[in-house]
Structures are given as structure tokens and as C-alpha cells.
């Protein structure tokens, strides 16, 4: 006579929400008679879940005839998974006692969990920019996701980076399960049309990541770089001043022209010329009348760029001593 | 092939003990329940107790309890029903019969053994 | 304790007749109930049980029915060697009870 074994083949179960779940129990042997019951948990509080004899158990259904003398099938479906069906699920043999029926056997049990699927990865970055040679974090935030096991991988145009952390919460068994990561990107003078990724992979997605991206140009400030250049124009005493500003980022940049220190102009950049890497170039010209000035002129031009502290590039232009007798007077 | 097979008729006075057997053969004792029913002449059937194939365990009808008692040898596949302080209103067939599935019907019964109570 | 009530206490019918017999059980019992046929003289014979499988061995023409309280047991041509009488049990709690009987004679 084969002695009884309670088989549930499957040990874990994934099951989305709102589906049916189907927990298989097969048993060996017909013997001893008895109901075969099932619980989620275990101990004394574990949860009743079927019972052929007692209870109302409008979402369990048997997948075979139990009235059948000969069943062996004891599997159950349950119907419109929630949250709170999650958990360790156990077919129990019992012999029939007086007054309460006496626990025979239990199958291995089968853990369900729930199927869900993370969502979009959200990717933050620094609060506040920084130049290049500079260290910036991005932030990559995925949640709702079960089981708890995912793969999370950053990358920066395409190519992988091995610097972060990645923290999964909570620790412990819970319903559902969030992810955290954060990657440390070094800035390079180039990097205004850099991205970076931040990929998730998880059962439930059938090898089909998901992908949250986040603009380098966001994080970065390349600060200008300045040349003034002087040209004499060929009518009358007139010189014209130059002022370039090269390979800057963002766009937001004012320029103030000082003649002795006086403010002359101050002029916020408009027409800007794109660089291919994304950064910006703008030139401003000033046109001065040397003619009428009897002293040498000190021709400053200061640039704020994003909000910094201003930077300044100053030029002298000297006067002819027959020219320092006049009155000065500037073009502008 | 399965059998339930009950001891003899037997006459008692009022007041005295009965102890019927039942032999089970064809199963394991242990693997199955018994229960006794008893049938008064012309009456219908009446449940007197449960006895646990698996351990022993029992339960009786309340009108018997304290005078009926039901015990098992599975060294020999046999299951006992003794009812004591005999009175003439216990004059009946008594059945053993094997509870057959968890459902708790019965599907197999003893030919039965009859009981006269009499002074 | 559970009441089993059924009826009727007694018929008349003729072979080919279908028969009809119920049960009413004093407090739902889902679907554990038993019937049983016995014959003047011998043990009972398990007929249907879990309200309406049928035991093995057992004519087609029995069938059982009904959940809850109600229950029906029908022969749906009755035979020569069915008359006999009919008992229903409830298999739910303890104390088992069984219903009064169903007598079943040729007209």
C-alpha cells in the first residue's frame, strides 16, 4: 500500500493582479480517507482558504470533481488576485476527529507572488549644475514591482557604467518592491548632448527593459571662454572692439561693456551660433571714436554666465598726446 | 474484495452489557472510519456513534452517551460497539458500516447483528 | 442536531413509473448527503452520495439532486427490483442523522 504524499509541484507562483491563479495539489494515494483542506500559512493563525465541508469561499473554485471517489486533483483556482493574496499556500490532509479533524500531511506548499510590473524608470539629476572634471549624480527610481528580484543597469551614450549604488526596498517580504539607484557621472567639456539611461530588467517584462533617460545638458555648465580683439577701421579714428565668447552652456548670458568704468552697454545674448557639440558662441562688438579722447581708454566687457560671479576682460586703448587736449567722444 | 463481516445474534436480560464485533476485511482498518447504526423492528435507521480507523477516536449520539463504547484492534482489523445497561427499547439490528470517501457516506455495511433485549 | 425530513413516508407506483422522493435537511449541509436503499431484511445499499454522485455499481436510473437544504432522489423508470424502502442521511456534523424513510410498494 503506497503511502500518501501531498504534491504541489510548484514552488513559486507568479500571478498580476486582478488574474486567477491556479495552485496545483495532487496526492499518491486515495488513503487514508479524509478531506484535504487548505490553509495560507502556517501555525496556529494560518488562513483558512478552502474547506469542501465549511465556509463560503466565493472566489475558490476545485479544478476537478471532488465528489468523484476517486479523485486525486485536490487543486484549487482563486479568482481575482489582490495584494493580500500573497503568500505561502498549503494543501493539508486531515483524518477526521471528534470534536476537530486531525491535520494528516501537508504538501511543501507554493509561495504565490505577485506579478507586477515595475514602472517607468524616473531618472533625476543634480539639483544644481556643475562644470566639467566635476562628479554629478543621477537618481533612477522604479516601484510597484514583484517579485523583488530586478536587474538595474546605467549607461552614458550607450556605454555601461560601473559606478553606482542600487538599494531595493523593503528588505523583507512585502507585496510589492521598489528600486533606487544612484550613479556618479564625471562631466566632460562635450557632454551637453550626452544622456544618460538608466534600464530596468524584470520577469514580468519578457526581457523587454525599461528605460528612463536624463539629459546631461541638464546637469552641465561650461563656462565661456573670452578673447577681445581690437581692429582700426580704416574711415576716421575709430577703433572696433571684438568680444568673443566661445563654447558656453546654457544660453543665458549677459554682457556689460564698461569704458573707464562707466556702464556704456549691457546686452543679453540672442543670436547665438551652435557649436556641434552643443555648447553656444557669441560675439559684441563696440565701436569707439578715438578722435576726441584726451586720455587713454580702459574698455572693460564683463560677462555673467548662468547666474556666476561675473567674469571681467579689460583693454586699453591709448590715446596720441596731440589727442589728449580734446574732449573724448565714443560711438556706441 | 471488501467485507464487513458482524458477530452473531445475541438475547439479553435488561440491565446487562452487549459487545458486537465487526472483522474487517479486503482494507486497512486504519485507514478508514467506522460508524454504528442500529434499526429497531419496523423502524427507520438511527446513527449511534463514530470510531476513528486512524486513532480511535470517537463520537456518540447524546441519548447513548455513557452507555455505548466503541474501541478497535487493528492488530486483528476489528472494531467493537459495547453498549451497556440494556434496556428492551435497544432490541435491534446493529450495523457497522465503513465511511467511504470524505464526503462520509457510507459504502459499506455489515450484514448486521441482531439484539433482543429481554427479560 | 439536524433535522432530516423526508417524503413521502410511503408510495405506490408501477414498474416504469419515474419516482420522485425528497429530503429536507433542518439547516443547509452544502451537498452531504447520502441515500440509501435497504430491503426487508438486509443492510442498507449505498446509492448516491455527495448529494448526487453515484456510487459505483449502481443503475443510471437513480440520480440525486439539490444543495443547501432540498434534495431529490429520482428512479427514472422504476424497476422490479427497486421497490424497496429509501433513507437519506445527512454526512455533515455529528450527530449523523437519517430521515424517516421512503417506502417504496408496487400499486
Known amino acids: 500500500e503506497e503511502e500518501l504524499q501531498m504534491i504541489q509541484p510548484e514552488k513559486l507562483l507568479l500571478v498580476a493582479v486582478g488574474e486567477s491563479a491556479t495552485l496545483n495539489c495532487t496526492v499518491t494515494s486515495l488513503l487514508p480517507v479524509g478531506p484535504v483542506l487548505w490553509f495560507r500559512g502556517v501555525g496556529p493563525g494560518r488562513e483558512l482558504i478552502y474547506n469542501q465541508k465549511e465556509g463560503h469561499f466565493p472566489r475558490v473554485t476545485t479544478v476537478s470533481d471532488l465528489t468523484k471517489r476517486n479523485n486525486m486533483d485536490f487543486s484549487i483556482r482563486i479568482s481575482s488576485i489582490t495584494p493580500a493574496d500573497a503568500g505561502t499556500y498549503y494543501c493539508v490532509k486531515f483524518r477526521k476527529g471528534s470534536p476537530e479533524n486531525v491535520e494528516f500531511k501537508s504538501g511543501p506548499g507554493t509561495e504565490m507572488a505577485l506579478r507586477a510590473k515595475p514602472s517607468a524608470p524616473v531618472v533625476s539629476g543634480p539639483a544644481a549644475r556643475a562644470t566639467p572634471e566635476h562628479t554629478v549624480s543621477f537618481t533612477c527610481k522604479s516601484h510597484g514591482f514583484s517579485p523583488r528580484d530586478i536587474t538595474l543597469k546605467w549607461f552614458k551614450n550607450g556605454n555601461e557604467l560601473s559606478d553606482f549604488q542600487t538599494n531595493v526596498d523593503p528588505a523583507g517580504q512585502s507585496v510589492s518592491y521598489s528600486i533606487r539607484s544612484t550613479a556618479r557621472v564625471v562631466l566632460a567639456p562635450w557632454d551637453v548632448r550626452s544622456q544618460v539611461t538608466c534600464e530596468v530588467a524584470h520577469v514580468t517584462l519578457q526581457g523587454d527593459p525599461l528605460r528612463g533617460t536624463a539629459n546631461l545638458s541638464e546637469a552641465i555648465r561650461v563656462p565661456p571662454t573670452l578673447e577681445v580683439t581690437q581692429q582700426p577701421m580704416r574711415a576716421g579714428n575709430q577703433v572696433n572692439i571684438t568680444y568673443q565668447v566661445r563654447n558656453f552652456y546654457p544660453q543665458n548670458l549677459q554682457l556689460t561693456w564698461l569704458e573707464n568704468g562707466n556702464v556704456c552697454r549691457t546686452e543679453t545674448a540672442s543670436t547665438l551660433t551652435e557649436n556641434k557639440d552643443g555648447t553656444y558662441n557669441w560675439t559684441s562688438w563696440l565701436l569707439v571714436n578715438t578722435s576726441d579722447q584726451r586720455d587713454d581708454v580702459v574698455l572693460t566687457c564683463q560677462v555673467k554666465h548662468d547666474g556666476q560671479l561675473a567674469v571681467n576682460k579689460s583693454l586699453v586703448l591709448e590715446v596720441s598726446a596731440h589727442q589728449k587736449d580734446q574732449s573724448s567722444d565714443a560711438t556706441h | 474484495q471488501v467485507q464487513l463481516v458482524q458477530s452473531g445474534a445475541e438475547v439479553k436480560k435488561p440491565g446487562a452489557s452487549v459487545k458486537v464485533s465487526c472483522k474487517a476485511s479486503?482494507?486497512?482498518?486504519?485507514?478508514?472510519?467506522i460508524n454504528w447504526v442500529r434499526q429497531a423492528p419496523g423502524q427507520g435507521l438511527e446513527w449511534m456513534g463514530w470510531i476513528s480507523g486512524y486513532n480511535g477516536n470517537t463520537n456518540y449520539a447524546q441519548k447513548l452517551q455513557g452507555r455505548v463504547t466503541m474501541t478497535r484492534d487493528t492488530s486483528t482489523s476489528t472494531v467493537y460497539m459495547e453498549l451497556s445497561s440494556l434496556r428492551s427499547e435497544d432490541t435491534a439490528v446493529y450495523y457497522c458500516?465503513?465511511?467511504?470517501?470524505?464526503?462520509?457516506?457510507?459504502?459499506?455495511w455489515g450484514q448486521g447483528t441482531l439484539v433482543t433485549v429481554s427479560s | 442536531d439536524i433535522q432530516m425530513t423526508q417524503s413521502p413516508s410511503s408510495l405506490s407506483a408501477s414498474v416504469g413509473d419515474r419516482v420522485t422522493i425528497t429530503c429536507r435537511a433542518s439547516q443547509s449541509i452544502s451537498r452531504w448527503l447520502a441515500w440509501y436503499q435497504q430491503k426487508p431484511g438486509k443492510a442498507p445499499k449505498l446509492l448516491i452520495y455527495?448529494?448526487?454522485s453515484l456510487e459505483s455499481g449502481v443503475p443510471s436510473r437513480f440520480s440525486g439532486s439539490g444543495s443547501g437544504t432540498d434534495f431529490t432522489l429520482t428512479i427514472s423508470s422504476l424497476q422490479p427490483e427497486d421497490f424497496a424502502t429509501y433513507y437519506c442521511?445527512?454526512?455533515?456534523?455529528?450527530?449523523?442523522?437519517f430521515g424517516g424513510g421512503t417506502k417504496v410498494e408496487i400499486k
Open positions: 442521511q445527512q454526512t455533515h456534523s455529528f450527530p449523523l442523522t
Open positions: 458500516a465503513r465511511v467511504g470517501s470524505s464526503w462520509e457516506e457510507n459504502d459499506q
Open positions: 455527495a448529494a448526487s
Open positions: 479486503g482494507y486497512t482498518l486504519n485507514n478508514y472510519d
